[in-house]
Every structure is written in C-alpha cells, then in structure tokens.
C-alpha cells in the first residue's frame, strides 16, 4: 500500500538567536558573536 501524507515526523524546536557585542578593553576592540541555543557559533 502507498503511504498517506504526513509531516516529516521530526520535532521542530524553536531556538533563540542572540547577537552580542562584548567590550574587552580599550586596546583590544570588541568581540562580536552569534549565539544559537546557548552555543557561540561565530
């Protein structure tokens, strides 16, 4: 039998994207990053 149509079956988890800029001292500039779900990826 052919299968009926359904979704992929995978849960969709909505994650928060957080852009941040952190001042690390006048002579070192700034760190700019992107945190996805609590993990810094850039």
């Amino acid at each position: 039998d052919a299968e009926f149509r359904h979704d992929s079956g995978y849960e969709v988890h909505h994650q928060k994207l957080v852009f941040f800029a952190e001042d690390v001292g006048s002579n070192k500039g700034a760190i700019i990053g992107l945190m996805v779900g609590g993990v810094v990826i850039a």
Partner: antibody
Framework: QVTLKESGPGILKPSQTLSLTCSFS??????????VGWIRQPSGKGLEWLAH???????YYNPSLKSQLTISKDTSRNQVFLKITSVDTADTATYYC????????????????WGQGTTLTVSS | DVLMTQSPLSLPVSLGDQASISCRSS???????????LEWYLQKPGQSPKLLIY???NRFSGVPDRFSGSGSGTDFTLKISRVEAEDLGVYYC?????????FGAGTKLELK
Amino acid sequence: QVTLKESGPGILKPSQTLSLTCSFSGFSLSTSGMGVGWIRQPSGKGLEWLAHIWWDDDKYYNPSLKSQLTISKDTSRNQVFLKITSVDTADTATYYCARRSITTVVPEDYFAYWGQGTTLTVSS
Amino acid sequence: DVLMTQSPLSLPVSLGDQASISCRSSQSIVHSNGNTYLEWYLQKPGQSPKLLIYKVSNRFSGVPDRFSGSGSGTDFTLKISRVEAEDLGVYYCFQGSHVPLTFGAGTKLELK
C-alpha cells in the same frame, strides 16, 4: 472555532452522479498543511474513508472507488467537493467531511473536526 | 488494504467497570516518518464520530484521563478505567498510515 457542514441532494437514482459540498469555517485551505477528507457510513454500519485533499491540491483516493471519485476545492469560498459517478444503492449512506492538518503551526494530524453529515439515499 | 480487526464487537459493561477494546492491523502501521497513525473514535447514536486518542496513546484535548491507548506495530488497545454513562456508544480504531485509510468494524459498548 472550526466548523464543517456537508450538503448534498438527499435522493438520487441509480447511475446518477452524486455531488457533495463541504463548507467550512475557522481555517483556510490556503494555509500550508491543511487538508479535508470525506468519510461515509451506511446506516447501521461502519465507517469508510473515501478521499482527501490537501492545501496544495495533492489528492488521495480509496483505490476501490478511485474510478468513480473526484475530490476538488474552492479555496476562496472555503469549500471542498466530492463527486461520485454512477451511484448505486450501495452508495446509500451518511457522508461526512473532516479536517486533518499536518502544518507545524497547527499540528493536528487526526480527524478532530467533523461535520454533522449529509444523508444520501439511492433508490429507483 | 490494511485490515483493522476489532474485538469484541459487542462489550456489555456495568457503570464503573473497566473496559478494554483490542484492535489489530493486518500489517505494520508504522509510517516511514517513524510515527504510528493509530486513532480511536467514539460515535454515539445520531452523532458524528469524536476523536479520543491519536498516535496510539495521545489523548485529544478534553478527553477524560480514564481513557488510555497503548500498543505498537500491529497490536493496539483502548482502555476505559471506569465506564460512565456518557462513554456508551460505538468505538472505532483507525489507521492513517497507509492508503486507503481504514477503520475497524467498531465495538459497541453497552450496558449489561
């Protein structure tokens, strides 16, 4: 709230074509993942699934009746239609439409909402 | 077609009893996405069917917790822990994994 209501001719003669309409409110078939199906029930007997149509016009039919069935929709009027050609006395039944949704926004992949049914009698 | 076999076809009970309805499918109804689309519906005389359980064991909103569904593969069960008068009617199992979608023949829950 979601409501569905079926309408049909009530009585037909054998060999005629049955045209059913399901008019619904509370959702739109233009919404990704939405679908409406048809199920019938001869008096005092069990339920038989007939056909289903999805928002993107993807259609599924019961293979045992596929040559007789045509399901279609009018998205702007919130209606779904079922045609059954060459009806016989065995097609005497109550016909229901029901909603099923596979969208992640409304993940209701089950027949949670049904119409009240419309009764067809096929008699010569 | 996937044949859904329910037993018993008639189930006489007294109010307050536990009731158990079996549903067996003629083949696995596990979909390729990993879900099992096994549902239970209750139909009372003169009414359209009402959803009780979806995906084997999930109670639909508003369904009392005396209803529970279980099973896997081809063997499924609906249990009602304490039958109330409003529970009387015909129970149908249903598979939504394979075309054609199919219902069991129904189990009539009635008073002894």
